[in-house]
Amino acid sequence: HNTTVFQGVAGQSLQVSCPYDSMKHWGRRKAWCRQLGEKGPCQRVVSTHNLWLLSFLRRWNGSTAITDDTLGGTLTITLRNLQPHDAGLYQCQSLHGSEADTLRKVLVEVLADPLDHRDAGDLWFPGESESFEDAHVEHSISRSLLEGEIPFPPTS
C-alpha cells in the first residue's frame, strides 16, 4: 500500500477519505487506527456502527469521527480541532471476523495555524454543547508519498 499524506491546520478540522470497492467490502464494518511505530500494531481509534446497515451514522471517539458511505465506497474520518500530537501514520481498515484489511495508509501532517499569533478573542471556539455536524471542515491537502520517502524516521 502506498501512503497518502493529508495535511491539516492546527485547531481546524481535517477530513480524511478512504475510497474502496463497495462490493468487495460489502457487509464489512470499517475502522480507523493509529500505527504505533513502523512495525508496531495499529491501535483502533474508532470504528463504524456495530450494525453495518447503520454505517452512515457518524460515530465519535473523542475528537475523531468516522462515517461510511457503503454504496459509494468511501470511508470518511474527521479529526476535529487538529493538534500537533495527532500527526502520525494511520490506516483505514475493513473488518471481517477479527481480521482487518488495509484500505489505505494515511500520514497525517499538522501545519501551524497562521492565525495563532492573533489575540484569542479574535478566534471563534465552538462550545462543548454545539453541534459539529455543520461545522466548516477545512479542505485537506493530500498526496501520495514519493518513492523513497518514509513516514517514520529511520531507526538504528
Epitope: K24, G27, R28, W52
Partner: antibody, heavy 123, light 107 residues
C-alpha cells in the same frame, strides 16, 4: 439460481501439471469471494484459499503456500486452482464455494458449493 | 491457526431423537462460526452461520448456539434425511479452519 459448476474428474501422474475450474452463474460472480476447499479420501475439510474475482486479490492458507495457485478470469466468471507438479498426496476431492458476507455479522461463510472435482494422482 | 475440535466424532441416534454436537475453538472466536452438513459424495451445505443464524431453507429443527470458544448444533427431532456428517468452521481469522466432523448414524 446460484450455481457453481466445476470441471470433471482428473487422473494424473506425479509431476504433471493440472488446472481445474469453477464456473459461477446466477449471480454477480465478480462481487463475491470464491474459496477452494480440499477433502482427502475419508477425511475432513481443509480451506486452501480464497480469491476475489473482481481484482484477483487472494488469501492462501500457509499449508498450501507454494503448492497451488488460485486465479480467476472475471470475463468468463471462472475461478481456477492449479498445480505445477502434482504429488500422490494431492489425491482428493476439491470443492469451490462462494464466500458470502452477512452484513450483521461482518464475516463470511460458504453459502453455495460446487459439486466437487475428484483429482487422482497415481503412477 | 485456530484449532476446531468437535465431539463426539460419531453418534448413533434414532428418528425423532434430539441430538447435540459440540465444537470447541482453541481461542475465542466471538460468534464467527458456521455449521455444515455433508452427505456421502455430495458437497457440504451451509446450515448455520454467525453461530445461531439459520441459512435460508434450513428446517427449524436445526439450531446453533454459543460464543467465544464453545458452540453447539442441536437437531431437535431427527429426520431420516439428517443422517450425515456435520462440520463446524471458524470465520474469525485466516486460515479458515474446520472441525474434524461428526458422523451421525442411524441406531
Amino acid at each position: 439460481e446460484v450455481q457453481l459448476v466445476q470441471s470433471g474428474a482428473e487422473v494424473k501422474k506425479p509431476g504433471e501439471s493440472l488446472k481445474i475450474s469453477c464456473k459461477g452463474s446466477g449471480y454477480s460472480f465478480n462481487s463475491y469471494w470464491i474459496a477452494w476447499v480440499r477433502q482427502m479420501p475419508g477425511k475432513g475439510l481443509e480451506w486452501m484459499g480464497t480469491i476475489y474475482p473482481g481484482d484477483s486479490d487472494t488469501r492462501l492458507s500457509p499449508s498450501f503456500q507454494g503448492q497451488v495457485t488460485i486465479s480467476a478470469d472475471k470475463s468468463i466468471s471462472t475461478a481456477y486452482l492449479q498445480w505445477s507438479s502434482l504429488k500422490a498426496s494431492d489425491t482428493a476431492m476439491y470443492f469451490c464455494a462462494r464466500s458470502r458476507t452477512f452484513y450483521y455479522d461482518s464475516s463470511d461463510y460458504f453459502d453455495y458449493w460446487g459439486q466437487g472435482t475428484l483429482v487422482t494422482v497415481s503412477s | 491457526d485456530i484449532q476446531m475440535t468437535q465431539s463426539p466424532s460419531s453418534v448413533s441416534a434414532s428418528v425423532g431423537d434430539r441430538v447435540t454436537i459440540t465444537c470447541r475453538a482453541s481461542q475465542g472466536i466471538s460468534s464467527w462460526l458456521a455449521w455444515y452438513q455433508q452427505k456421502p459424495g455430495k458437497a457440504p451445505k451451509l446450515l448455520i452461520y454467525a453461530a445461531s443464524s439459520r441459512q435460508n431453507g434450513v428446517p427449524s429443527r436445526f439450531s446453533g448456539s454459543g460464543s467465544g470458544t464453545d458452540f453447539t448444533l442441536t437437531i431437535s427431532s431427527l429426520q431420516p434425511e439428517d443422517f450425515a456428517t456435520y462440520f463446524c468452521q471458524q470465520a474469525d481469522s485466516y486460515p479458515r479452519t474446520f472441525g474434524q466432523g461428526t458422523k451421525l448414524e442411524i441406531k
